[in-house]
Structure formats: C-alpha cells, structure tokens
Interface confidence: low
C-alpha cells in the first residue's frame, strides 16, 4: 500500500517578512519522526502520531519547503511552494527639464526599486490621470521610459509614475504605489529678435521712451526682460497681452554717457535669450544762450550782444556766424531809441551723426530814452465845430512810457487824449500837451479853434 505525506497549506502567498504555520501529516501507521527541510528559520510547534506542526518566520523570498518521513523503511515526501509578495520600496519619476520647448520630445523616466513578484508588477507613466505608457517591471531596479512630445497644454501639467502589483489571482487584490508628481513647464520662444523702438539721438539729461516687443511668446508672463542704455539698466514696465510681451522704459542720458551708445533689450524664457540692439548717440547741446551786456541800456550807450553754446555747436547771431563751432558770436551797437524792443536772434546748429539739430533763442533789448510826442500824429492847429465829437490823436513815446496830458493855458482844464469827447466853444484856446516820465518832459503846443454853432 502507498502512503502519502501532505503539506499544508499548499503553495501559500504571504507578504515579505511574514510568518507561516506549516502542518505535515501522513496516513502511514508506523511512521517515524516527520522532518521539515527548508532554508527558512523554522521551529517545531507540536507533533503527534503521524503529524508535526512548524512555524516559519521572517519569510523574505520565494521558497520551497519539503516534509519527509520514513514509513516501513521507505522515505516518503511532500512539498509546498511559498510565494512572497512585496510592494516597491521606491517609486520615483526622474526630474523633468526646468523648461521644455513646445514641439520637442522629452523623456519620462521612472525607477522602481523592490517589489515582488516581478511577474505581477507593472509600471504606468501618467500625465494627469492619462496613461502614457504601461510596461512590465524587469531588472532591479526597474527603469521604464516614455517619449512625450511637449505641447502648450502640457504647461503646468503634473506627470507621475504608478506601480501596480496584481495579486488578484491569489485573492489578495491590486496594490498601487504612486510617485510624487512632477510639474512640467513648456515654452515657446520665437527665433526672431524683439522689436526695439528707441531714439537715434538722446540729449544729455533728457528722457525718451524705449519700447521692446516680442510676439509669439508662451507663457509671456514668465519671461524676463532686461533693458539697458550702455551699462545703465533701465527700469522697465512689462505688459503681457496674450502671446505678446511689451516692455516700456524711459531712457535718461547722463553726461558721462555722451557719445555712441547701445540700447539693448533681451528677453529670457526657458533659459534661452533673444536680444535686440539699437545704436544711439548721446549728445550734449547746451544753449544757445544770448546775453546782453546791459539788458536795459541808456540811449547812446554801447551794448554788446553775445551768443554762446556748447562745444561743437555753430552759432549765428542776427545772421552773423561765429568764427568756428564752439565759439561765441558777438555784435556791438550804440543804443538808440529805435533799438528799444529790438529782438536779437541766435540760432545754434549741432551735427550729430550726419544729422543737423537746430535750436533758437532770442533776447529783447530795452533802451531808456526821454519822452517825445510825435508831431505827425499830433496836429498843432485844430479847427473843430462846436457840439461835435472828436478825438485828440496825440501819441507820446519813451522808455519808461511817458504820461501824456494836455492842459489849457491859464487854467487847469484838461482835454482827454486818445478818447472821443464832445467839443464846445469853451474848449477854444491854446493847450500845452506834455509827455512826462522819470527821464524828463516834452511839451508840444496845440491850438484848438472852435467854430461856434450857427443856428441859421
């Protein structure tokens, strides 16, 4: 008769590091002591006629256990295969590029350490919750890759790696581990340089707007802009509108920057840079400054008019040019009454990079002269009719401007000057018209002959 040796449980599955209670039993009536052969740590828990119970502890790997016993001088055996399962110790998605150009491929790389049985372990690469790749875990550590074409929609998207240990056929379920997600930043930087709008010339101590624009930029809000005049960084205001970035700054030239300079605009995104440069000439254009030796001159005195400007500037004073650029133009005159209120004009011309820049300035001369009454405008003999309306058209001149009064001789009667008034016979007589100012008096005699009104 053939006797059996049973090992229970048959082909068990347990988690790594666990313990297992194993029972070996035989139906042989004259069996000897049952032995358990295994590389695992074992302990005899109990035994009796035809059976023995063992405890296996710290089961870390797949193993085969063998029970044996001598029955009537013959050895009989029974075996069981232990399958150990373990979750991965590490699931890690490799770092993504800090910035990824749209339209170019990048590689997702996931590394998995541990996890068994490998035949039941799958690695999944994900964008959001979308599966990009599903591959079995092989080798140790397992490395799974997927190539992805970057799109604008991927900007800010989380990528992750998931492991699935499928112990469902063993009745234990599906064990899932997920890596920490990594966020992708994608960008578009056109190959064209920015459009830089800047002045060709900039005068020292003056300000001018500088604009730098770049279209087709994504994400425009992440771009860095550097605007500079020479080595002077400009304080730029950056605006984004869709995929267009505009940086605006005010360039102010300093005296130490005079000469050929460059305005630079560079836009940096995703570690790449696009740059535009424009040449600019910083120039100094002082003046023209027109000076009078005496702004207010006395009649008969000598007045010097001079016009000056900065170096390299050609000045012309009342049509008379200076001897050379950078030199002063001058003229002298004897101040006369006719020079009062005269304007002296100075024009200045500076050549900057083949362009001629012009500036003008003027000054007005005041000449102090005594009062005069223009005889041409002040008739000395007037024949007017009684009870008619007339104007005494006398005009005085002088600097300071004189006061003109016409008083009847032998009385304090005054007739208005330059204002219409009604004439009557009492106005008949001789008048002293006197123009007076701080510079003296001037008198003109005016006779008014009033013809009596005839009722016939």
């Amino acid at each position: 008769q053939e006797f059996l040796l049973r090992v229970e449980p048959q082909n068990p599955v347990l988690s790594a590091g666990g313990s297992l209670f194993v029972n070996c039993s035989t139906d042989c009536p004259s069996s000897e002591k049952i032995a358990l052969e295994t590389s695992l740590s074992k302990a005899l828990v109990a035994s009796g006629m035809g059976w023995a119970a063992f405890n296996l502890s710290n089961v870390t790997g797949n193993s085969r256990i063998l029970c044996s016993v001598y029955c009537n001088g013959s050895q009989i055996t029974g075996s069981s295969n232990i399958t150990v399962y373990g979750l991965p110790e590490r699931v890690e998605l490799a770092p993504l590029p800090p910035w990824q150009p749209v339209g170019q491929n990048f590689t997702l790389r996931c590394q998995v350490e541990g996890g068994s049985p490998r035949t039941s372990l799958t690695v999944v690469l994900l964008r959001w919750e979308e599966e990009l790749s599903r591959q079995p875990a092989v080798e140790e550590p397992a490395e799974v890759t997927a190539t992805v074409l970057a799109s604008r929609d991927d900007h800010g998207a989380p990528f992750s790696c998931r492991t699935e240990l499928d112990m469902q056929p063993q009745g234990l379920g599906l064990f899932v581990n997920t890596s920490a997600p990594r966020q992708l930043r994608t960008f578009v930087l056109p190959v064209t340089p920015p459009r830089l709008v800047a002045p060709r010339f900039l005068e020292v101590e003056t300000s001018w707007p500088v604009d730098c624009t770049l279209d087709g930029l994504f994400p425009a809000s992440e771009a860095q802009v550097y605007l500079a005049l020479g080595d002077q960084m400009l304080n730029a205001t950056v605006m984004n509108h869709g995929d267009t970035l505009t940086a605006t700054a005010t360039a102010t030239a300093r005296a130490d920057q005079e000469g050929a300079r460059e305005i630079v605009c560079n836009v940096t995104l995703g570690g790449e840079r696009r740059e535009a440069r424009e040449n600019l000439t910083v120039f100094s254009f002082l003046g023209p400054i027109v000076n009078l030796s005496e702004p207010t001159a006395h009649e008969g005195s000598t007045v010097t008019v001079s016009c000056m400007a900065g170096a390299r500037v050609q000045v012309t004073l009342d049509g008379v040019p200076a001897a050379a650029p950078g030199q002063t133009a001058q003229l002298q005159l004897n101040a006369t009454e006719s020079d009062d209120g005269r304007s002296f004009f100075c024009s200045a011309t500076l050549e900057v990079d083949g362009e001629f820049l012009h500036r003008n300035s003027s000054v007005q001369l005041r000449v102090l002269y005594g009062p005069k009454i223009d005889r041409a405008t002040c008739p000395q003999h007037l024949k007017w009719k009684d009870k008619t309306r007339h104007v005494l058209q006398c005009q005085a001149r002088g600097n300071p401007y004189p006061e003109l009064r016409c008083l009847k001789e032998g009385s304090s009667r005054e007739v208005p000057v330059g204002i219409p008034f009604f004439v009557n016979v009492t106005h008949n007589g001789t008048y002293q018209c006197q123009a007076s100012s701080s510079r003296g008096k001037y008198t003109l005699v005016v006779v008014m002959d009033i013809e009596a009104f005839s009722s016939h």
Partner: antibody, heavy 119, light 112 residues
Framework: EIQLQQTGPELVKPGASVKISCKAS????????ILWVKQSHGKGLEWIGK????????TYNLKFKGKATLTVDKSSSTAHMQLNSLTSEDSAVYYC????????????WGQGTSVTVSS | DAVMTQTPLSLPVSLGDQASISCRSS???????????LHWYLQKPGQSPQLLIY???NRFSGVPDRFSGSGSGTDFTLKLSRVEAEDLGVYFC?????????FGGGTKLEIK
C-alpha cells in the same frame, strides 16, 4: 559669501606686459560692475576703469587708456586687467572691486595684487 | 576731474574720543538725478579698503552706528562718536558722480 579673489604678486621687467585676474564668487557675476583701482605710495588711490561683465562694455579713466585693458570671462566669473609697456611708475598694488548698477559705491574689494616693475 | 581734498592728513586720537574727517570736492557731487555719490572707505593696515558709508550718509551692512556721514554739494564730513582700536587705519572719501571716479588723499587715524 561674496568674494573677489585676485592672483598673486608679479615681478616683471620694464617694457613687458602683465595680466592680473579677479575671480568672483558668492553672487551672479553678470549682475554687478567690476572696477579696478591702483594704489601707489606717491599717488594714493586711482580709479583705472570699469567693465560690465554682462555686455563686456568698458569705461576708462583717460589717464589709463592704452595702459590698461579690461576683459571678462563669463564662463569662469573672472575679470582680467592687462597692463602694457610697464615702467617703474606702474609698480603698485592693484585692486579689483565690484559695485551694483550705476553709480553706487564699491562694496566688496579683492585682496589686491602687487606688481613690481624692475630690471 | 573732481579733485577730492581731505583734512586732516593725520588724526591722533585717544580710544573713546570723538573723531571728525572733512572731505571737500572741487565741483558739486550732486548728480542730475538728485543723488550725491560721495562714499567713505577705511583701509586697515595690510588690508584692502572696505566700504563704510555710501551716498553721503548710508551705513553699509555690518558697519557700527558710531560711524556717521553728512554733508552736501561739495563739503562732506565723516564722524566717529567713540573711537575703538579696530577703527585705526586710513580713511578715504571717494566720488562716483563724475567720470573718472576720484579718491581723497586719505586721513590716517592713529593713537595719541
């Protein structure tokens, strides 16, 4: 820690040239201007010139134009100054220093490089 | 060039004393932007110059509050309220308003 490390002392013959270096660390090299200053016993401190490492643009004291040439190597964060046609008048300690954008003070200085011109 | 004149040339003091150094420029150091770029440096024996005060009156980081700067236009002063042993050395004023930048001749602060 911001540091400017200059090369060691130089003993050179009259008529020769010398190139001294200044390696910057502890900050972004292209963010600050590098300046060079001469210190001699007779003349005190004299400003030689400055260079913007970002663009490589230079401004010189007219007194040193033709005598000193300033350059930078962005990849190694190093500024260089070459002195040409050396005479005994050029014997001095040369310092590099850095400053923020125009026109603030020289906030960090190198330890100085002694140049001795002698036959 | 802006010529910087420092006085005195030498300043003997006792520890704990107050000290004052004057710096005069041959031209105004007020920049067209309104700022005045006058700075003070200290060079201790065997060392490089170190920044103390920038733009007339601003203490550089780590500089004790016993150092103060004042002045405007062409006349500037550096004051030490209580001199300590570590303050000994040569003090330089410097301007960076005009190119070329220029330095004063230095004032040596020493123990009486």
């Amino acid at each position: 820690e911001i540091q400017l490390q200059q090369t060691g002392p130089e003993l050179v013959k009259p008529g020769a040239s010398v190139k001294i270096s200044c390696k910057a660390s502890g900050y972004s090299f292209t963010d600050c201007i590098i300046l060079w200053v001469k210190q001699s016993h007779g003349k005190g401190l004299e400003w030689i010139g400055k260079i913007n490492p970002y663009f490589g643009t230079t401004t010189y004291n007219l007194k040193f134009k033709g005598k000193a040439t300033l350059t930078v190597d962005k990849s190694s964060s190093t500024a260089h100054m070459q002195l040409n046609s050396l005479t005994s008048e050029d014997s001095a300690v040369y310092y590099c220093a850095r400053k923020e954008a125009y026109p603030d003070a020289m906030d960090y200085w190198g330890q100085g490089t002694s140049v001795t011109v002698s036959s | 060039d802006a010529v910087m004149t420092q006085t005195p040339l030498s300043l003997p003091v006792s520890l704990g004393d107050q000290a004052s150094i004057s710096c005069r420029s041959s031209q105004s150091l007020v920049h067209s932007n309104g700022d005045t770029y006058l700075h003070w440096y200290l060079q201790k024996p065997g060392q490089s110059p170190q920044l103390l005060i920038y733009k007339v009156s601003n203490r550089f980081s780590g500089v004790p509050d016993r150092f103060s700067g004042s002045g405007s236009g062409t006349d500037f002063t550096l004051k030490l309220s209580r001199v300590e042993a570590e303050d000994l050395g040569v003090y330089f004023c410097s301007q960076s308003t005009h190119v070329p930048y220029t330095f004063g001749g230095g004032t040596k602060l020493e123990i009486k």
